[in-house]
């Protein structure tokens, strides 16, 4: 077959080819930020000629053009400046209201490099209607100016802009407009991952929050974010595998779907996951009717087995057939469970469609969506039972209109997105499901998104101050108890002056709590082995502090999961009947276990906990420490089996002031405390300028750095004695 010519450069940009210069290969142009390619792509035809999708005239030279944002077409009851036909990247538009009207939304908006305005639609409202003035987004025209119950407004976009959101909205009895705000956007615009992740995540969390048959919510509360521990969710993942998706992109689709599956199983809800890949025909890799669809490892393995070559004989994009296979699955499940049963009616359904283009065969996908809505009996009362997320990737041949038509429309939520590339998709799925905003005491949740603060990443982390100076660190293990090190308390038992500083979303300095009660392990005595030539001994270096008040759970304050508890068992998704030994085997399951602790400046630092034979060689180094242990004959006199050991190779060493802080691991997007920082042979902070400066030990240092952490699996009897009525412990 002939190959296509190679004279396809774009001035100021680059291009990629999905299948080289061969027929069927898709050439995709990209430009630096703030510019967009025109045309966006070309397809190599079997004749050996390049064709530009959607183009009517002959092949023109590809160029990078400046991105612009749409201008307001009309702005009611106020004025905007400057008045331009469209706005350059970085350009601002400002809004002011006439007397008697109050500005809602953003008074100043800036054009972003993706062709989208930042902020929110500015509206001048006098509060006269049953519903608030729905406003007119930039570039849109609205018909309908009455905002009473039952009134409707319609929107269209000017010139060549594309409408996403609802083209028609109705003022509902609860004073809220139906559907979702319409936005007019340039056909070449796309969404930034940092905008999509929270939008998608909020909507998804809402939907998960509703996954609870016993929960009654007032309609006016909207869909409250509240992850519950019961109810059932069917999640259908649809992955486009058509010709225009390169094999590498398909791998990222798979990886993103795996992230999603991993994350969804980290929620404490019952979930079944279906996996469908599609091109000209759909292929069901996992059905919700299969019991394995409830098992994360099985779902992930069916995803891993998804093969790009499965669809090489039919390379079109048949989105209708993919959605129809979801409909058929639902139909079978309904027949199986019985149409009238609660078991069927209380299942929530979420469909995530990952595609890179418009459907080009099999009929309108909207028809399949209509069938799905019908079988699930979706009406205003049951609107929460179905969410369809349509995610276009690649901004080349993605059809905004089609995505918008497929995505659900819910007030204050978005369900249709276009991302620049598969890397952006991966980023979104990494950060979208953020449980950290929950107000209940769900444990071990940290915000992992790139723009989260240190305290949001490790919200269990607290600072302990005896007077003015910070001394030690600790970890919230419930809303009123902190776990820390005993050696922090060496002034007898007067803790009236001590304070515990806990994260607080309202203040970057946190919030101070008094200590109601300090429970210091009676076994701790730093001088216990002085007569054996062991000048400092840290066995039983553990303490619990009961705070004078309960901590309000937030993004900045939340307990970490303690292994061997039911709370941790749920987070690990382990079966009921699991034991403490099972948790130890799952969490400390290698010779070298990657773990973390929190530095003085709040950042998360990495260590490796040495287990088994590696523990022995890790601890052995202590014999070289002649000052603290002048005549040590047996290392185990100092490093008992109560300690975990780290500090080899590239590990960071904790500073003295980091004592008592959690040593923790991440599993399934949740965090588990396995130890607490106790003592070490090297202090990287000693004499430093401030909390941000740490010195690495010179390679020649004798003894080399080693750090020892109290192993919580070895402190179970003591923990159970004092926390038995606070946490639910598993059998040993």
């Amino acid at each position: 077959a002939p190959s296509c010519p190679q004279n396809v450069n774009i001035s100021g940009g680059t291009f990629t080819l999905s299948h080289g210069w061969a027929p069927g290969s898709l050439l995709t142009y990209s430009c630096p930020q703030g510019l967009y390619p025109s045309p966006a792509s070309r397809l190599c035809k079997s004749s050996g000629q390049w064709q530009t999708p959607g183009a009517t005239r002959s092949l023109s030279k590809a160029v990078c053009k400046p991105v612009r944002c749409p201008a307001p077409v009309s702005f009611e009851n106020g004025i905007y400046t400057p008045r331009l036909g469209s706005y350059p990247v970085g350009g601002n538009v400002s809004f002011e209201c006439e007397d008697g009207f109050i500005l809602r939304g953003s008074p100043v908006r800036q054009c972003r490099p993706n062709g989208m305005w930042d902020g929110e639609t500015a509206v001048c409202d006098n509060g006269a209607g049953h519903c608030p003035n729905p406003g007119i987004s930039l570039g849109a025209v609205r018909t309908g100016f009455r905002f009473g119950h039952g009134d409707k407004v319609r929107y269209r976009c000017s010139s060549n802009l594309v409408l996403t959101g609802s083209s028609e909205r109705e003022c509902q009895g609860n004073g809220v407009w139906s559907g979702t705000e319409p936005i007019c956007r340039q056909p070449y615009s796309y969404d930034f991952p940092e905008d999509v992740a929270p939008a998608l995540g909020t909507s998804f969390s809402h939907m998960l929050g509703a996954t609870n048959p016993t929960q009654k919510t007032k309609e006016s509360l909207g869909r409250k974010i509240q992850i519950q521990r019961s109810g059932h969710l069917n999640l259908y993942l649809l992955l486009d595998c058509s010709q225009s998706v390169s094999e590498n992109d398909f791998l990222i689709f798979k990886e993103s779907a795996s992230l999603m599956v991993d994350r969804i199983f980290s929620f404490e809800i019952n979930v079944s996951v279906a996996i469908i890949t599609f091109a000209s025909e759909p292929k069901v890799l996992m059905s919700v009717l299969n019991d394995n669809s409830r098992d994360m490892t099985e779902v992930i393995s069916s995803l891993e087995n998804a093969n790009y070559k499965d669809h090489e004989n039919g390379t079109g994009t048949n989105t209708y057939a993919a959605l129809n296979s979801v409909y058929l699955m639902m139909n079978n499940q309904m027949r199986l469970l019985g149409m009238e049963t609660m078991a069927w009616q209380e299942i929530r359904h979420a469909i995530i469609l990952l595609t890179d283009g418009k459907s080009n065969m099999g009929g309108s996908p909207k028809t399949a969506v209509d069938h799905i809505r019908e079988i699930l009996n979706i009406n205003q009362k049951r609107n929460d039972y179905l969410d369809i997320y349509a995610i276009g990737v690649g901004k080349l041949d993605v059809d905004w209109r089609e995505l918008n038509e497929l995505g659900s429309k819910k007030d204050g939520e978005r369900h249709a997105f276009i991302l620049q590339d598969t890397k952006a998709l991966h980023q979104v799925f990494e950060h979208m499901l953020d449980v950290s905003k929950l107000t209940d005491t769900i444990c071990g949740v940290g915000n992992m998104s790139a723009n989260a603060s240190d305290q949001e990443r490790t919200p269990w982390h607290v600072t302990i101050k005896p007077k003015s100076q910070e001394t030690c660190r600790g970890a919230l293990i419930s809303d009123q108890w902190v776990l820390t090190a005993a050696h922090c308390f060496r002034d007898g038992n007067d803790h009236s002056l001590w304070r515990v500083n806990v994260g607080d979303p309202k203040s970057q300095w946190g919030k101070e709590f008094l200590i109601e009660k300090a429970v210091i392990s009676p076994g701790f005595d730093v001088f216990a082995k002085k007569n054996q030539g062991i000048l400092e001994f840290y066995g039983d270096d553990i303490a619990l502090l009961k705070l004078a008040q309960k901590v309000k759970m937030s993004t900045h304050a939340r307990p970490i999961c303690l292994p061997c508890t039911m709370e941790a068992n749920l987070a690990l998704r382990r079966p009921q009947g699991s034991t403490c030994r099972d948790h130890e085997n799952e969490l400390l399951n290698k010779q070298s276990v990657p773990a973390h602790f929190v530095a003085l400046n709040g950042s998360k630092l990495n260590i490796n906990l040495k287990m088994g034979v590696e523990w022995t060689s890790c601890a052995e180094v202590v014999s070289q420490e002649k000052t603290m242990f002048p005549n040590l004959t047996d290392v185990r006199e100092v490093v008992t089996d109560q300690f975990l050991c780290s500090g080899t190779q590239e590990d960071e060493s904790p500073c003295k002031g980091e004592s008592g802080g959690a040593v923790f691991l991440e599993r399934r997007f949740r965090f588990f405390q396995v130890g607490l920082v106790s003592w070490g042979l090297y202090n990287p902070c000693l004499g430093s300028a401030d909390k941000n400066s740490r010195k690495r030990a010179p390679r020649s240092k004798v003894p080399p750095p080693r750090d020892f952490h109290i192993n919580l699996f070895r402190m179970q009897p003591w923990l159970r004695q004092h926390l038995g009525d606070v946490l639910n412990f598993l059998p040993l």
Epitope: P466, C472, R490, L535, E536, T627, C655, K656, G657, K691
Partner: nanobody, 122 residues
């Protein structure tokens, strides 16, 4: 907070010895890590040595290791710095410091003495 007063500084020849003392007021002395810092004219204040609240562990800057020894006597609320084999570059004002955590971060230290001058010169 602990009040600290240094003494023992003076003029000494290269190769000579000197013993600095730092006396602390306050019944909580035994709970604090104690340390010595020094500041040469026109230079930053730098860490010299520290001793743990137990007296069981000591730390030294590489530049003084093997020549200086830090010790404490909790019954006298005093910490000492024995300086041997003194060199011209040891010339500085020596400060005593108390720190509850043991990190001796310069930005956080609030218990300092007024300093004692050590001059090493022939």
């Amino acid at each position: 907070q602990v009040q600290l007063v240094e003494s023992g500084g003076g003029l000494v020849q290269p190769g000579g010895s000197l013993r600095l003392s730092c006396s602390a007021s306050g019944h909580t002395f035994r709970s604090y890590y104690m340390g010595w810092f020094r500041q040469a004219p026109g230079k930053e204040r730098e860490f010299v040595a520290s001793i743990s609240w137990t007296g069981g562990s000591t730390e030294y800057a590489d530049s003084v290791k093997g020549r200086f020894t830090i010790s404490r006597d909790n019954s006298k609320n005093t910490v000492y710095l024995q300086m041997n084999s003194l060199r011209a570059e040891d010339t500085a004002v020596y400060y005593c410091a108390a720190d509850y955590s043991g990190d001796f971060l310069l930005s956080d230290l609030d218990s300092w003495g007024q300093g004692t001058l050590v001059t090493v010169s022939s």
